[in-house]
């Protein structure tokens, strides 16, 4: 906490200029008006401050808006926002998609911070939904923002926002977040035609169940292995080897190459050897010809 | 010991086709999927496509879609590709190569193909 | 289609020296759930088939010297001779095999100094 302590004779700051930066910390605290100072904001970031000096600053601020800043100051923190705490944010309003971008360039080519992560939630929570504009803008910043999200803050993204979602955002999601995100996107690009539907729907297609990956194995899609391997092992087991050789194309002769992994390894013990056979690979632990295959699942359910 | 043998050299007039075989021994020839690939002179390497030996399900490099064929003899464990409307450009050294899981193990020895009037 | 770009085109190295070539793809090659990239390395003497080296990125092919060696992850890939042998002087080529059309770098020419 500075002192309060008065301004010496002609010291009283005019205007935020370049001169302040020569004040010691109770110069600033006495002669810099806190009304000025938050309708010159935008002249803060071009003055080299200390550390210690954009402290008093925000001292200055919090004095002057004890129930949170307007909007008009928010926009023009720069650097000044790195000093701010995510108790501080939670008493902003954030509304406009420049201020948001203006304050997560001040972070850009960091970590997502605490501050960031609040600023974001209170800017998605005022504005109901996660629009395209905005995940466009998250994205841009933080490409691993979607794979953030908990499912149930996915379920607020309208289907018209996945346009703006790129392969690499979806890069760290798991199975439950793209269980949420996968009928979305189907929704999205359902009115494109086949091999476009399929590009813009292959990031997707980890939350697919087995129906839609039967529906595309119709379509000559030939998707790449590593696509494949993020399918859901449950909408891949059901799958019939004349099925992946049509939704692998060329890529099936792949399947060798990784048949230690799963879903690969798991969909092998499911088929028949002979079944196996016809894909060339010379692929072993198929299910012995002249064996009977018991569903013990349906069994269950009868009994 | 994995051996592919591909057919000699073969001189052509332009509009005309190809056909390159490739024997294969050494190895379960229904087991690995077969590759061609071309090298024209002081060139890189351009792959053509590949094949199913068990099924004979090809798959071809869009470039050649319309002129290759790749078809396969199991009785003579023997890879063919076809290639036809021959031009000039399509002087190269046609090579079959055996695949190891997706990368190419083994190679013919391969067929110089030379297109002139 | 994904490129594959080779760097340098050629290289001249002493005998015993090390000889680094790089390949860059245009776009990932790894496979996230087996952690496999999909890059393999070939060698191609004068006159003769290329023989495989490297596959999976750094995996070396057996009864390849280990003087060769592949690195990198994603996009970024490296061969490396850690002691040029006169056997050496070949044409190299990186290839991926991860989604068709499989594409070859353009070939970096190996030579003694």
């Known amino acids: 906490e500075v002192e309060k302590t008065a301004c010496p004779s002609g010291k009283k700051a005019r205007e935020i200029d370049e001169s302040l930066i020569f004040y010691k910390k109770w110069e600033l605290e006495a002669c810099v008006d806190a009304a000025l100072l938050a309708t010159q904001m935008d002249r803060v970031n071009a003055i080299p401050f200390t550390y210690e000096q954009l402290d008093v600053l925000k001292h200055k601020l919090d004095e002057l808006y004890p129930q949170g800043y307007p909007e008009s100051v928010i926009q023009h923190l720069g650097y000044l926002f790195l000093k701010m705490s995510p108790e501080d944010i939670r008493k902003w309003n954030v509304t406009s998609l420049e201020t948001l971008k203006a304050l997560l360039e001040v972070n850009k080519g960091h970590e997502m911070s605490p501050q960031v992560a609040t600023l974001i939630d209170r800017f998605v929570k005022g504005r109901g939904q996660l629009d395209k504009d905005t995940l466009d803008t998250l994205t841009a910043f933080y490409p691993g923002y979607l794979c953030s999200l908990s499912p149930e803050e996915l379920s607020s993204v309208p289907p018209s926002s996945i346009w703006a979602v790129r392969p690499q955002d979806l890069d760290t999601c798991d199975p439950r977040q793209l269980d949420v995100l996968y009928p979305k996107a189907r929704l999205a690009f359902q009115n494109m035609n086949g091999s476009e539907y399929f590009v813009k729907i292959q990031s997707f297609l980890g939350g697919a169940p087995t129906e839609d990956l039967k529906a595309l194995s119709q379509q000559n899609v030939s998707m790449d292995l590593a696509t494949f391997m993020k399918l859901r092992t449950d909408a891949v087991l059901p799958l019939t080897v004349a099925e992946v050789q049509k939704l692998l194309g060329p890529h099936v002769e792949g399947l060798k190459a990784e048949e230690r992994h799963r879903p690969v390894r798991d969909w092998i013990l499911r088929q028949r050897q002979d079944d196996l056979d016809t894909l060339g690979l010379g692929l072993q632990g198929g299910i012995p010809n002249g064996y009977l295959v018991l569903d013990l699942s349906m069994q269950e359910a009868l009994s | 010991e994995v051996q592919l043998v591909q057919s000699g050299a073969e001189v052509k007039k332009p509009g005309a086709s190809v056909k390159v075989s490739c024997k294969a021994s050494?190895?379960?020839?229904?087991?690995?999927?077969m590759h061609w690939v071309r090298q024209a002179p002081g060139q890189g390497l351009e792959w053509m496509g590949n094949i199913n030996p068990s099924s004979g399900d090809s798959y071809y490099n869009e470039r050649f879609m319309s002129r290759v064929t790749m078809t396969v003899d199991k009785s003579t464990s023997t890879a063919y590709m076809e290639l036809s409307s021959l031009r000039s450009e399509d002087t190269a050294v046609y090579y079959c190569?055996?695949?190891?899981?997706?990368?190419?193990?083994?190679w013919g020895q391969g067929t110089l193909v030379t297109v002139s009037s | 289609d994904i490129v594959m770009t080779q760097s340098p085109d050629s290289l001249a190295v002493s005998l015993g020296e090390r000889a680094t070539i790089n390949c860059k793809s245009s776009q990932t090659l790894l496979n996230s759930v087996s952690q496999n990239n999909y890059l393999a390395w070939y060698q191609q003497k004068p006159g003769q088939s290329p023989k495989l080296l490297i596959y999976f990125a750094s995996t070396r092919e057996s009864g390849v010297p280990d003087r060769f060696s592949g690195s990198g992850s994603g996009t970024d890939f490296t061969l490396t001779i850690s002691s040029l042998q006169a056997e050496d002087v070949a044409v190299y080529y990186c290839?991926?095999?991860?989604?068709?059309?499989?594409?070859f770098g353009g070939g970096t020419k190996v030579e003694i100094k």
């Open positions: 190569a055996r695949s190891g899981g997706l990368w190419l193990a083994f």
């Open positions: 290839q991926q095999h991860y989604r068709t059309p499989y594409t």
């Open positions: 050494g190895y379960t020839f229904t087991n690995y999927w």
